[in-house]
């Protein structure tokens, strides 16, 4: 009686179970009464990453420099190429098909996490006691100057965008 289900790494065709092709190889002929499944290795710049019955290998991803991409990890017959972005850019999606410049944190905000090739800058508002007066992709919020430690007093209060202004203490005669 012909099988209705096959073992792992097999597939059902013409009422018989045939072996799947291993990762890195494509199917060129189903098994027959007289022969096993016939598979051939994927060509240069092609891959298949699972046990399969694909008749064509997938093309490796192209990391297009015109889109700001570069190769992070070269593909093999069993894995796709992994792209990342050039310095100063990050991927627009998880699949990293294009790149955009890193975001700068505006005055009043500091860098919480510096951008990588795959993630954008994460900014945070400067909390009380801290400020940022620049638009930057690297600068964190800086603490207000401590006037006391310089034997000075606050003449102008700080904000999230400006430092405090220190001045000499009023001498009472």
């Amino acid at each position: 009686e012909p099988p209705t289900a096959c073992r792992e790494k097999q597939y059902l065709i013409n009422s018989q179970c045939c072996s799947l092709c291993q990762p890195g190889q494509k199917l060129v002929s189903d098994c027959t009464e007289f022969t096993e499944t016939e598979c051939l290795p994927c060509g240069e710049s092609e891959f298949l990453d699972t046990w399969n019955r694909e008749t064509r290998c997938h093309q490796h991803k192209y990391c297009d420099p015109n889109l700001g991409l570069r190769v992070q990890q070269k593909g093999t017959s069993e894995t796709d190429t992994i792209c990342t972005c050039e310095e100063g850019l990050h991927c627009t999606s998880e699949s990293c098909e294009s790149c955009v410049p890193h975001r700068s944190c505006l005055p009043g905000f500091g860098v919480k996490q510096i951008a990588t090739g795959v993630s954008d800058t994460i900014c945070e508002p400067c909390p009380v006691g801290f400020f940022s007066n620049v638009s930057s992709a690297f600068e964190k919020c800086r603490p207000w100057t401590s006037c006391e430690t310089k034997d000075l007093v606050v003449q102008q209060a700080g904000t999230n965008k400006t430092d405090v202004v220190c001045g000499p203490q009023d001498r009472q005669r």
């Epitope: 002929s29 027959t32 007289f34 022969t35 096993e36």
Partner: antibody, heavy 114, light 112 residues
């Protein structure tokens, strides 16, 4: 039913290219492979190679540098070319449908001689 | 390549004799699927080979029951239980487990 018929010149000069055609019926070239096998007079059988349904090929490593197998699906024909032939390539050449090992062509004798 | 070695290369026998031909491969013919792709062919002068046995022991349709195949791994046998006049021919073993496919050198069965 499945049938295969080999054809081509029976005499080829040394150093020239041997060219044979296998015309098939009863099965479809876009879905099935075709093998070439040869047999020198009074000797054993030697697998030459195969062209698969999608056009990919496998060749016997001992002949790989000289052999090309191609096909024309629309004409139901498979072609064998063997370059730089010598007397050692004198043989009966058979074609065979993959999965139809019970059905061989009748074979065609090719003699390499000047 | 896998070498297929047949023995004997020729033998003389009489009608009614039991004939055994052996075939040894240089490496195992067991595929990772568990199947063993070992065929036996019969060839008569001026004719193409005809399939007798496939996958070691399966008789092809229309092949008389006097032909049987056995063996495993690297050692295989074709047995003709009672030789008939039409069985005088050359017999080849063949493996299709590994590319390139290879054949034994043949065993010629002649009339004694």
């Amino acid at each position: 039913q499945v049938q295969l018929q080999e054809s081509g010149p029976g005499l080829v000069k040394p150093s020239e290219t041997l060219s044979l055609t296998c015309t098939v019926s009863g099965f479809s070239l876009p879905t099935s492979g075709v093998h070439w096998i040869r047999q020198p007079p009074g000797k054993g059988l030697e697998w030459i190679g195969v062209i698969w349904a999608g056009g990919d090929t496998n060749y016997n490593p001992s002949l790989k540098s000289r052999v090309t197998i191609s096909k024309d699906n629309s004409k139901n024909q498979v072609f064998l070319k063997l370059s730089s032939v010598t007397a050692a390539d004198t043989a009966v050449y058979y074609c065979l449908g993959h999965g139809h090992f019970d059905v061989w062509g009748q074979g065609t004798l090719v003699t390499v001689s000047s | 390549d896998i070498q297929m070695t047949q023995s004997p290369s020729s033998l003389s026998a009489s009608v009614g004799d039991r004939v055994t031909i052996t075939c040894r491969s240089s490496q195992s013919l067991v595929h990772s699927s568990g199947n063993t792709y070992l065929q036996w062919y019969q060839q008569k002068p001026g004719k193409a080979p005809g399939l007798l046995i496939y996958k070691v022991s399966n008789r092809f349709s229309g092949v008389p029951s006097r032909f049987s195949g056995s063996g495993s791994g690297t050692d295989f046998t074709l047995t003709i239980s009672s030789l008939q006049p039409e069985d005088f021919a050359t017999y080849y073993c063949s493996q299709t487990t590994h590319v390139p496919w290879t054949f034994g050198q043949g065993t010629k069965v002649e009339i004694k």
